[in-house]
């Protein structure tokens, strides 16, 4: 189960001066993600930093049991045993992929 959250922040400005930049980037980037630069290892506290080609921003693929923009929160999602015809009910959890704006 993957959730994506987007947070809008000030201080960022789009680089739209040169349209050819965007075209070149899209042409050259066929894969969805490339690794962040190595010095960004600290961007995700409990997870892997990825650079999303489509989103044009860093994102975190959180380790199991963690969530949040920087995988900084413990994920307490659990499997509940529910009486009745439905034996198991899934509540949240899973692999979280958070994008940073």
């Amino acid at each position: 189960n993957t959730t994506t959250t987007t947070k809008s922040e000030d201080g960022h400005y789009a680089r739209t001066d040169y349209a050819e930049n965007a075209n070149k980037l899209e042409e050259s980037a066929r894969e969805h993600h490339i690794p962040c630069p190595e010095h960004y290892n600290g961007f995700c506290m409990h997870g892997k930093c990825e650079h999303s080609i489509n989103m044009q921003e860093p994102s975190c693929r959180c380790d199991a049991g963690y969530t949040g923009q920087h995988c900084e929160k413990k994920d307490y999602s659990v499997l509940y045993v529910v009486p009745g015809p439905v034996r198991f009910q899934y509540v949240g959890g899973g692999s979280h992929h958070h994008h940073h704006h």
């Epitope: 809008s8 960022h12 680089r15 739209t16 630069p37 190595e38 290892n41 044009q56 920087h70």
Partner: antibody, heavy 124, light 108 residues
Framework: QVQLVQSGAEVKKPGSSVKVSCKAS????????ISWVRQAPGQGLEWMGG????????NYAQKFQGRVTITADESTSTAYMELSSLRSEDTAVYYC?????????????????WGQGTLVTVSS | EIVLTQSPGTLSLSPGERATLSCRAS???????LAWYQQKPGQAPRLLIY???YRATGIPDRFSGSGSGTDFTLTISRLEPEDFAVYYC?????????FGQGTKVEIK
């Protein structure tokens, strides 16, 4: 507009320490990597290390490992670089720099914003 | 660490001429993580090109970057008086981040 403002020039004795500050304004501070780069007189640029304030994790160039400490205070949007056991070869202009990734159609992790530089002179 | 070697060390040209600056890496560098900076005396460096070929905001189109792998080039198509400065390449995909030693573009 993002601005990085550094502390003033310092004159230090060999063997002592110096702590240079870099205050960010005009944008989000916590999630950007802040680097420290130095430039000795007439020389090129040398990356010392940096930090992502949100995590507090710093990493350093091996040359400076054990002698440099980079920290950040999210509450004041200020990054610090402390260099110890100073020697004359540490005389340089020290810059803080921030990357400039954006939510635009193209992006960069290169150093888009720079402080004005802080001259540190090490002399007996 | 990745060593970046720039050539030539100094380039003596006249305004209006074309400048070609080279940056060679000791091992392959991702094109996503190669930048060029301009620095004038007494000033902080200024980002010109990132991702090997993308101009930073506000940079005139006479500046262009190209290359891949271990060989990268910064070209200034027609030198203006304000372009005479020192130029540095930088790789920022691998830690430690490294810079080339610089190329000085001076007036002939």
């Amino acid at each position: 507009q993002v601005q990085l403002v550094q502390s003033g020039a310092e004159v230090k004795k060999p063997g002592s320490s110096v702590k240079v500050s870099c205050k960010a304004s005009g944008g989000t501070f916590s999630s950007y990597y802040i680097s420290w780069v130095r430039q000795a007189p007439g020389q090129g640029l040398e990356w010392m290390g940096g930090i992502i304030p949100i995590s507090g994790r710093a990493n350093y160039a091996q040359k400076f490992q054990g002698r440099v400490t980079i920290t950040a205070d999210e509450s004041t949007s200020t990054a610090y670089m402390e260099l110890s056991s100073l020697r004359s070869e540490d005389t340089a202009v020290y810059y803080c720099a921030r990357d400039g990734y954006s939510s635009g159609r193209s992006t960069t992790y290169a150093f888009d914003y720079w402080g004005q530089g802080t001259l540190v002179t090490v002399s007996s | 660490e990745i060593v970046l070697t720039q050539s030539p060390g100094t380039l003596s040209l006249s305004p209006g001429e074309r400048a070609t600056l080279s940056c060679r890496a000791s091992q392959s560098v991702s094109t996503y993580y190669l930048a060029w900076y301009q620095q004038k005396p007494g000033q902080a460096p200024r980002l010109l090109i990132y991702g090997a070929s993308y101009r930073a905001t506000g940079i005139p189109d006479r500046f262009s970057g190209s290359g891949s792998g271990t060989d990268f080039t910064l070209t200034i198509s027609r030198l203006e008086p304000e372009d005479f400065a020192v130029y540095y390449c930088q790789q920022y995909g691998h830690s430690p981040i490294t810079f080339g030693q610089g190329t000085k573009v001076e007036i002939k």
